[in-house]
Interface confidence: medium
Amino acid sequence: SIPWNLERITPPRYRADEYQPPDGGSLVEVYLLDTSIQSDHREIEGRVMVTDFENVPEEDGTRFHRQASKCDSHGTHLAGVVSGRDAGVAKGASMRSLRVLNCQGKGTVSGTLIGLEFIRKSQLVQPVGPLVVLLPLAGGYSRVLNAACQRLARAGVVLVTAAGNFRDDACLYSPASAPEVITVGATNAQDQPVTLGTLGTNFGRCVDLFAPGEDIIGASSDCSTCFVSQSGTSQAAAHVAGIAAMMLSAEPELTLAELRQRLIHFSAKDVINEAWFPEDQRVLTPNLVAALPPSTHGAGWQLFCRTVWSAHSGPTRMATAVARCAPDEELLSCSSFSRSGKRRGERMEAQGGKLVCRAHNAFGGEGVYAIARCCLLPQANCSVHTAPPAEASMGTRVHCHQQGHVLTGCSSHWEVEDLGTHKPPVLRPRGQPNQCVGHREASIHASCCHAPGLECKVKEHGIPAPQEQVTVACEEGWTLTGCSALPGTSHVLGAYAVDNTCVVRSRDVSTTGSTSEGAVTAVAICCRSRHLAQASQELQ
Amino acid sequence: QEDEDGDYEELVLALRSEEDGLAEAPEHGTTATFHRCAKDPWRLPGTYVVVLKEETHLSQSERTARRLQAQAARRGYLTKILHVFHGLLPGFLVKMSGDLLELALKLPHVDYIEEDSSVFAQ
């Protein structure tokens, strides 16, 4: 039998025998910034190189006694989880440890920065294969720590960090809040979020995914063959660092954006009980538990997309919220969401040479979120086509008129405070898939893309009676790129993508009344890339 | 005691290497900002990361650090440059009194300053 955590991240095809997936991360070097470690532990002996880097604060308290085994405890366990020969995820990965946490597990932002700089300099002096940096630590939000992580990520390094053990929004902590970092929350054997005393795993939009983080068996620094069970988001992050090492070993050319999309794609979906999270965080927190891909190759044909939520706009009348994709990703659609339902829609706009998704709050609104659908689409050429408010009874419409461009997403934005629930719903003309249709008082924005072999289709699901939630999903082999609601009446709180499903949320049924304008239609745009599929077949 | 002597030695060198009081004003219209940890118990006042603008060279970082030391010395403050950053972010880590923040924010090339803070094993 294998420990629950290794079983959880292992696809069934690997489970027949003891956990021994191919490659084991042997082409990858994992840097660990943590406490000192016991490098002669059987689990990690010969796999972990202890660098001469050390930058730690003095231990607190005059009566503190340094005990080697306690000083090494956290780092040794994590090194074992990543690459331990028996209880590790990536048994072939080699590691390098930097000491940035003292014997009490405490460090400084400045010490961590100097450690990250050390890694960058090592990378420049002696370029090796893919690098993964594991940061199993957290402090308060730090602009400088996030900036350093961004720079290192842009130098081609994959950074994985703990979401934090504060049962709080991960966006309030660093490096968890750095968008370029893969931020990992912790779940237990029952796929529940981990509780740690009165606290527990962090959550929210800054978490990329969850991984096993409770009762994880790993190397103990008590002796060279001892094991101990530890819990926390550090352990969860170590699993993802191991999975990343495995994936990069199989496909060393993967970019950070490709790796993140694959981690999300191969995760177990919708297994976490969201009731554990505060209500306002549930929609923002990804319901994903990390897993290894079922095979090391052959994922290249897939069109990968993920959902990126913005920070909350705040309640002021003109407040806006912006969601951005990573540098290597394409923004294929933009939607918005407001718990109060008071919003003025969203639009895609250029910012610094890249498209971003901006959502607008309305007067009396408690604030909005912008939701970007960010996809990997090589050789894509995307643009936004806008139609101003038509004022015509048929509503506003816009389509992709350029040859070879397909519709990947629709957004609508209005200046009026209330589109009004008493106006008749807009009916969408059938047989025109390349067209966005919206309220006559709204401007409509179509995201139109050209990419080799890209094909898209529109899928709708309408419910005549008012419903709090309407969903429509893309079928197997197709990827959700756009998610919006028809019509854009004010009782719609917004639309957003959850994995391959478009979700349209409406106000509580009891407050809207069951009239004809209560009808809500969820509109999904589903795409696939024949070019990527062909390219992958040719490789095989 | 040894450490203090080192500080004074550094200070004297800094004074000697700077023209008296000729601090360049920061570029017009850009104001450097100060950041600190929102969680009070995690703050580490007295140590600051001075982050310089993106294209700043190592030599400029070192010059800016020395200038800060010189200007601080003229006001009777002791400072210690703990590390000069280059490779990821341009800047330096300095041990100094919080009284000098206003002065430091006006130095040329400064983008922002962040007070050091604690991080913890998770």
Epitope: I2, P3, E45, D222, C226, F227, V228 | -
Partner: antibody, heavy 121, light 109 residues
Framework: EVQLLESGGGLVQPGGSLRLSCKAS????????MHWVRQAPGKGLEWIGR????????KYNEKFKGKATISRDNSKNTLYLQMNSLRAEDTAVYYC??????????????WGQGTLVTVSS | DIQMTQSPSSLSASVGDRVTITCRAS??????LTWYQQKPGKAPKLLIY???SLQSGVPSRFSGSGSGTDFTLTISSLQPEDFATYYC???????????FGGGTKVEIK
């Protein structure tokens, strides 16, 4: 099926030396530590030392330091025990054993059949 | 150094009896204690690891308990094939070494 096969035992003169072999099959040799344990006639088990075939690192019982040398040849999946300056009290059955991992602990899970070494003039 | 003391050194019992063997460590060995069974002329066989976990293929009449310094091996209903010598073994942190108990011989009454 995991198998460990010892060889090299026999009669040795006091002061002499010998090399025992343990051929492993049925698993990845370099992934498991290997131990040597001996048992004098009518007595209990006594640990001699172990080797990590992956790194070649060894650890010995204080009593056998300088007397026993454990080595391995990963290409042959074979473990060795070299014993020097043998005396009558080294007469024993010598076992090799694999150190298996079991959810947070280790144990000598597979043992060879043993090879008898008799030290006598 | 850790010493492992087994008691009794030998015992006589009948088929169907409940048999208990104890093993005491001179220092705390946590749960890192293993039990082996050895029959005459044969190599030892792993019974229990981590103080209480039964090795696969070992009959469920064998059980182990204990932690720290005091451990017990119990055979709930002795079978003819159980007549053998039983050894406990622990890991000595301080020496990075392995220590066996003196053994307990279970004989037919």
């Amino acid at each position: 099926e995991v198998q460990l096969l010892e060889s090299g035992g026999g009669l040795v003169q006091p002061g002499g030396s010998l090399r025992l072999s343990c051929k492993a099959s049925g698993y990845t040799f370099s992934s498991y530590w290997m131990h040597w344990v001996r048992q004098a006639p009518g007595k209990g088990l006594e640990w001699i030392g172990r080797i990590d075939p992956y790194t070649g690192g060894t650890k010995y019982n204080e009593k056998f330091k300088g007397k026993a040398t454990i080595s391995r040849d990963n290409s042959k999946n074979t473990l060795y025990l070299q014993m020097n300056s043998l005396r009558a009290e080294d007469t024993a059955v010598y076992y090799c054993a694999r150190y298996g991992y079991y959810l947070g602990s280790y144990a000598m899970d597979y043992w060879g059949q043993g090879t008898l070494v008799t030290v006598s003039s | 150094d850790i010493q492992m003391t087994q008691s009794p050194s030998s015992l006589s019992a009948s088929v169907g009896d409940r048999v208990t063997i104890t093993c005491r460590a001179s220092q705390d060995v946590s749960r890192y204690l293993t039990w082996y069974q050895q029959k005459p002329g044969k190599a030892p066989k792993l019974l229990i690891y981590a103080a209480s976990s039964l090795q696969s293929g070992v009959p469920s009449r064998f059980s182990g308990s204990g932690s720290g310094t005091d451990f017990t091996l119990t055979i709930s209903s002795l079978q003819p094939e159980d007549f053998a010598t039983y050894y406990c073994q622990a890991y000595d942190y301080s020496l990075s070494g392995y220590v066996f108990g003196g053994g307990t011989k279970v004989e037919i009454k």
